[in-house]
């Protein structure tokens, strides 16, 4: 699977269950790990900090003792466990630690992990709420007039709304500059689309729309392949055995595999 | 201890400067103020630190105007770029200098960086189709005000358009819809008191002009035996290729 660095992670859990939030800070020799919660429209607030050397959680005043627990599966790895979830536990959870980069001062700055969105809901959803892709290939008008082509990747019927999309050429790890619409609610699920405009010289390359979502099959990034487009003048081959529908639209079945 | 960011949101064009205000209350005599940038992905990135006993902090395009007596610590971002669009948080740090210290945050100010004022530019309009799905792609226009209409007699559903800033600092937009008669759907756009149609951009081609998916050796290619050199699609239908994943 491709590696979407940093950024969007989500965990969806029903009420009264537990959730695990993994800290993605790669800090060696951290003495304390702090846990913050940010809920939309509010100020981020610290919930607790974990004393690494004494393996002890220190909660902010007013928080119930059994609610939060920091688990350390191995050295320099931390997981926040939340118990007895309620909908109001929903929000973005961050781990953080002080980076004393400048020895002349007591501390320099607080570094935050990339954040995990916790969604606590009892909504009854379909068994499969992974993003369902539909692809759009460039219009011939665009490729002819503008010497460029736009690929569009539509993703529908996913839950929760936390999703990350990026684009790459087939044999490259370089993330290409793309654009996307806001995530839109449709009934109880969400849809989003992203598009990539490439110059004419790149139309003969295969492109990939790479999607990270909590409910992707096997937990790996979903890769949607956009085939290369050849825009030269050629002749039809009557022996071509590709099936076409009545509208002469070529139908291809793309296997959903991820490296 | 309290931090107040009164501006919930602010908009400013590229190249200009924006100042984000932050007031705080503290009984500590010595402390630090931190500014963070929260990306749309929710990542929280440290920008700059202001010490209560230090000169105004400056780091690249970020500068702090610190007034200790007024308990005010304003962040100025100069020479704004489109990538500066984000939510900015002001945070007060405990004075202890200990690794257990917490940050007290404000509610944040959302900064939206807009394109600069520039000449009005007429959009290009293209239609892309896949099965019942139709997308109207509207490229490189200014100003932002636009009405996009997918013209069809058999609408199933339509979505609000996405209007975003293009890399060139103009606007791009996409409007999606589902239609029973997708083959006949066209797109018309009202912009700057003029109407532009997708049909204005259609290329008249003869029947020998085709576009095909290029031969490729990728193992993730379609399972049908269609991705060999002879898999050919009519040019005018290239954007109707349906890949069902």
């Amino acid at each position: 699977s491709s590696n979407l660095e940093g950024g969007t992670k989500s965990v969806t859990r029903p009420t009264r269950s537990s959730a695990e939030i993994t800290c993605d800070l790669t800090v060696i020799n951290a003495f304390y790990i702090h846990w913050y919660l940010h809920q939309e429209g509010k100020a981020p607030q610290r919930l607790l900090y974990y004393d690494v050397s004494n393996s002890k959680d220190v909660l902010e005043s007013g928080l119930s003792p059994g609610k939060y627990y920091t688990h350390t599966p191995r050295r320099w790895s931390w997981i926040l466990i939340l118990r007895n979830l309620i909908e109001n536990d929903s929000g973005v959870y961050y781990c953080a630690t002080w980076d004393r980069g400048n020895p002349k001062t007591h501390y320099y700055k607080k570094l935050f992990g990339s954040g995990t969105t916790l969604v606590v809901t009892d909504k009854q959803l379909d068994a499969d709420v992974s993003p369902k892709p539909t692809i759009f290939l460039p219009s011939i008008a665009e490729t002819k007039l503008q010497k460029a082509g736009t690929y569009l990747c539509l993703l529908e019927k996913f839950f929760p709304d936390v999703i990350k999309i990026h684009w790459q050429e087939k044999k490259s790890n370089t993330i290409l500059g793309s654009q996307e619409g806001n995530t839109m609610k449709t009934n109880d699920t969400y849809m989003k689309f992203s598009w990539l405009t490439v110059p004419e010289k790149s139309l003969d390359k295969e492109h990939r729309c790479i999607v990270r979502h909590e409910n992707n099959k096997n937990g790996v990034d979903q890769e949607i392949i956009f085939p290369p487009i050849k825009t030269d003048v050629i002749t039809m081959d009557p022996k071509d055995n590709c099936s076409k529908d009545a509208n002469d639209t070529l139908l291809l079945q793309l296997t959903n595999t991820s490296a | 201890q309290k931090v107040t960011q009164a501006q919930s949101s602010v908009s400013m064009p590229v190249r200009k400067a924006v100042t984000l205000n932050c007031l705080y209350e503290t009984s500590w005599w010595s402390y630090y103020i931190f500014w963070y940038k929260q990306l749309p992905s929710k990542e929280m990135i440290f920008l700059i630190r202001q010490g209560s006993d230090e000169q105004n902090a400056k780091s690249g395009r970020y500068s702090v105007n610190f007034k200790k007596a007024a308990k005010s610590v304003a962040l100025t971002i100069s020479a704004l770029q489109l990538e500066d669009s984000a939510k900015y948080f002001c945070a007060l740090g405990d004075p202890g200098g200990l690794n257990t210290d917490k940050l007290i945050f404000g509610k944040g100010t959302r900064v939206t960086v807009e394109p600069r004022s520039q000449p009005h530019t007429k959009p290009s309009v293209f239609v892309m189709k896949n099965g019942t799905n139709v997308a109207c792609l509207v490229k490189e226009f200014y100003p932002k005000d636009i009405r996009i209409n997918l013209v069809s007699s058999k609408k199933i559903t339509e979505f609000d358009p996405a209007i975003v800033i293009s890399p060139s600092g103009k606007y791009n937009a996409v409007k999606l819809g589902k239609y029973e008669d997708s083959n006949s759907v066209t797109c018309s756009v009202q912009h700057d008191n003029k109407t532009v149609h997708s049909t204005d951009f259609e290329v008249k081609t003869d029947s020998t002009d085709h576009v095909k998916p290029k031969e490729t050796e990728n193992t993730k290619q379609p399972s049908k035996s269609c991705h060999k050199p002879k898999a050919i699609v009519h040019t005018e239908k290239v954007n109707m290729m349906s890949l069902t994943v």
């Epitope: - | 064009p13 190249r15 200009k16 020479a79 770029q81 600069r116 004022s117 520039q118 000449p119 009005h120 530019t121 007429k122 200014y142 100003p143 005000d145 060139s168 600092g169 700057d192």
Partner: antibody
Framework: QVQLQQSGPQLVKPGASVKLSCKAS????????INWVKQRPGQGLEWIGW????????DYNGKFKGKATLTVDTSSSSAYMELHSLTSEDSAVYFC??????????????WGQGTSVTVSS | DVVMTQTPLTLSVTVGQPASISCKSS???????????LNWLLQRPGQSPKLLIY???KLESGVPDRFSGSGSGTDFKLKISRVEAEDLGVYYC?????????CGAGTKLELK
């Protein structure tokens, strides 16, 4: 005072390319667009495009896309225009001009002295 | 593209007399920000163009106040209250409201 100093006259062969320069002084180079304008002998002014030295973004008159490439070197406060695949139609005087922000006046307030390009075999 | 039509193409005047040049655009030059980006330039013989007036009527610094600009929408005028010898040359109206920027063909001001 604000000045735009352009490179000297050029005699070039058809099919070749030529790169014209425009050195700015007397103001903050990265804060204003640099425009390029074409004037054929005895003719009017034709806008080619502009570049913003602050970030290198460009915008071209569609007629000159592929014909002209605009670049800047902020270290020397210089703007450049390269003209490709030259023909006799490209014989002209080319001006660079500073343009202020659209929030101010959006006007080309200072002009270079012009560079004459003659395309001839 | 927006077409800028200047009249007259040539204007013969006597020093000390007034002069007026008209410029019409094929569409309104009112920008969405409320401003009208219509400039007047003067190109003296053998020289580069020089900005006289911007935003229809604003005089560029250093330009004598005998020059004035007026108009709105699609109709614009440049007036010289009393022509002087140094005013001779070709006057261009230039619009910067619509992309691409376009100029009129020019009006040649000459002495009678």
């Amino acid at each position: 005072q604000v000045q735009l100093q352009q490179s000297g006259p050029q005699l070039v062969k058809p099919g070749a390319s030529v790169k014209l320069s425009c050195k700015a002084s007397g103001y903050t180079f990265t804060s204003y667009d640099i425009n390029w304008v074409k004037q054929r002998p005895g003719q009017g002014l034709e806008w080619i495009g502009w570049i913003y030295p602050g970030d290198g973004t460009t915008d071209y008159n569609g007629k000159f896309k592929g014909k002209a490439t605009l670049t800047v070197d902020t270290s020397s406060s210089s703007a450049y225009m390269e003209l490709h695949s030259l023909t006799s139609e490209d014989s002209a005087v080319y001006f660079c001009a500073r343009m202020d922000d659209y929030d101010d006046g959006g006007a080309m307030d200072y002009w270079g002295q012009g560079t004459s390009v003659t395309v001839s075999s | 593209d927006v077409v800028m039509t200047q009249t007259p193409l040539t204007l013969s005047v006597t020093v000390g007399q007034p002069a007026s040049i008209s410029c019409k655009s094929s569409q309104s030059l009112l920008h969405s920000n409320g401003k009208t980006y219509l400039n007047w330039l003067l190109q003296r013989p053998g020289q580069s163009p020089k900005l006289l007036i911007y935003l229809v009527s604003k005089l560029e610094s250093g330009v004598p106040d005998r020059f004035s600009g007026s108009g709105s929408g699609t109709d614009f005028k440049l007036k010289i209250s009393r022509v002087e010898a140094e005013d001779l040359g070709v006057y261009y109206c230039l619009q910067a409201t619509h992309f691409p920027l376009t100029c009129g063909a020019g009006t040649k001001l000459e002495l009678k």
